[in-house]
């Protein structure tokens, strides 16, 4: 039978090294065996390149295309082929379809004044256009209470968030994850980072513990818990 595309390719770029296109066929397809996505930058002398797609699901194909450090003017011509049959043709401008890279290395540290310091890394090198454009969303949730979650928007430059321990339930295990977007590029959100988990220990003031006692308790609890849940 003839090969048909059910949902045409949708593409996003991380605006540094990779563009990813995904599409859905009208029936289960061995993407790598049956299909090829050709792409060519609309620029004098540019060669045609071929991407071999992989299956994401039975009928969903995905292609990851290496690109040079993207600039606003870049436009790619895309052609989806099944052998000699052209299934779809379109163009793609990476700067208009940005999905930032996922923030990395999310960690939680006890900090002064009964706060937790959440830190992560900007996924872009300083010379990249997106490095200074990212804002972040941090999701903090109670591992045992789905109703207990908070969302923080980090719109300042530094990839950090200070969290008052008093805003979280004492003795509860919390997980945090972070994602990024680039407002000036009207990007989509990045994927969520892997979660990091920690045990919140906050003794209310009426317990009459001194600041140092509380901070030491936090540090001890955090270190013990961190060794048990190092890669959650």
């Amino acid at each position: 039978g003839s090969v048909k595309v059910l949902h045409e390719p949708s593409c996003f770029s991380d605006y540094i090294s990779t563009s990813v296109c995904q599409w859905k066929m009208d029936h289960p397809t061995n993407c790598s065996a049956e299909l090829r996505l050709s792409y060519q930058l609309d620029f004098m002398g540019s060669e045609n390149h071929t991407c071999v797609p992989e299956n994401r699901e039975d009928s969903v194909c995905v292609c990851s295309m290496p690109i040079d450090d993207a600039v606003e003017a870049d436009v790619y011509q895309l052609d989806l082929w099944a052998g000699q049959q052209l299934l779809w043709s379109g163009s793609f401008q990476p700067s208009k379809h940005v999905k930032p890279r996922t923030p990395g290395n999310l960690t939680v540290h006890p900090n002064i004044s009964h706060t937790w310091l959440l830190m992560w890394t900007n996924p872009y090198p300083t010379e990249n256009h997106l490095h200074s454009e990212l804002t972040y969303m941090v999701n903090v949730s109670n591992d045992n209470d789905p109703e207990d979650f908070k969302v923080y928007n980090v719109t300042y430059m530094g990839p950090t968030l200070r969290l008052a321990a008093s805003t979280l339930k004492s003795g509860a295990s919390y997980s945090a994850r972070v994602r990024a977007w680039a407002q000036t590029y009207n990007s989509t959100w990045s994927d969520w980072s892997p979660s990091t988990t920690w045990l919140n220990y906050y003794e209310p003031w009426e317990q009459h513990l001194g600041l140092n006692d509380i901070f030491e308790a936090q540090k001890i609890e955090w270190h013990e818990h961190h060794h048990h849940h190092h890669h959650h």
Epitope: L41, M44, G45, S46, E47, N48, D68, V71, E72, D74
Partner: antibody, heavy 125, light 112 residues
Framework: EVQLVESGGDLVKPGGSLRLSCVAS????????MTWVRQAPGKGLQWLSL????????YYADAVKGRFTISRDNAKNTLYLQMNSLRAEDTAVYYC??????????????????WGQGTLVTVSS | DIVMTQTPLSLSVSPGETASISCRSS???????????LDWYMQKPGQSPQGLIY???KRASGVSDRFSGSGSGADFTLKISRVEADDAGVYYC?????????FGQGTKLEIK
């Protein structure tokens, strides 16, 4: 050392044909686009044609489109310009030159960074 | 097609002085920030052209730092400081962004 050596220039009658060759050495020929430029006696430079490193993409000036064909043989490190339906106004020195690096997704540009010595084509009856 | 216009068409400069040649294109040659597809070439009588400047301001390998290129968009300038007798020749600008590529008419530099 990078070298480009053109050959094939000759005296030819109007309406005739000629094939110019440009043998390259000293650089990875297949990675670079190549260009032909000509210069009529006492005149300025005129760009004629470009071919990508693989030979998959070609471009032409309007003045020669449909009459001239650019091609390359990467196994022989040789660039060609097939010239048909030649006219008196095609009389010129023809230069080949190394153009942009096309093995990258966006070609890397260094201008026409090396030129051959030129070969003279004279079209006259 | 992009038209390249050079001024002046001829220039006479004394040794040690600075020569300045302008090149204007009918369309912007800026592809992205820092990427202006404008070159400068020099041709001496009876010789092949040689590249001086590419991407608006980058000196080709082996070219003296007396040669400098500047500009963006559609306006570019080649400056030759401390002109020497050996600098005599014809200077061409060329756009390398859009097909068909195109050269300016050339500027003849004469040393007094």
């Amino acid at each position: 050392e990078v070298q480009l050596v053109e050959s094939g220039g000759d005296l030819v009658k109007p309406g005739g044909s000629l094939r110019l060759s440009c043998v390259a050495s000293g650089f990875p020929f297949r990675d670079y686009a190549m260009t032909w430029v000509r210069q009529a006696p006492g005149k300025g430079l005129q760009w004629l044609s470009l071919i990508s490193g693989s030979g998959g993409k070609t471009y032409y000036a309007d003045a020669v489109k449909g009459r001239f064909t650019i091609s390359r043989d990467n196994a022989k490190n040789t660039l060609y310009l097939q010239m048909n339906s030649l006219r008196a106004e095609d009389t010129a020195v023809y230069y080949c030159a190394v153009d942009r690096l096309t093995k990258t997704i966006r070609p890397q540009y260094y201008g026409l960074w090396h030129w051959g010595q030129g070969t003279l084509v004279t079209v006259s009856s | 097609d992009i038209v390249m216009t050079q001024t002046p068409l001829s220039l006479s400069v004394s040794p040690g002085e600075t020569a300045s040649i302008s090149c204007r294109s009918s369309q912007s040659l800026t592809y992205s920030i820092g990427y202006n597809y404008l070159d400068w070439y020099m041709q001496k009588p009876g010789q092949s052209p040689q590249g001086l400047i590419y991407l608006g301001s980058k000196r080709a390998s082996g070219v003296s730092d007396r040669f400098s290129g500047s500009g963006s968009g559609a306006d570019f300038t080649l400056k030759i400081s401390r002109v020497e007798a050996d600098d005599a020749g014809v200077y061409y600008c060329m756009q390398g962004l859009h097909s068909p590529l195109s050269f300016g008419q050339g500027t003849k530099l004469e040393i007094k």
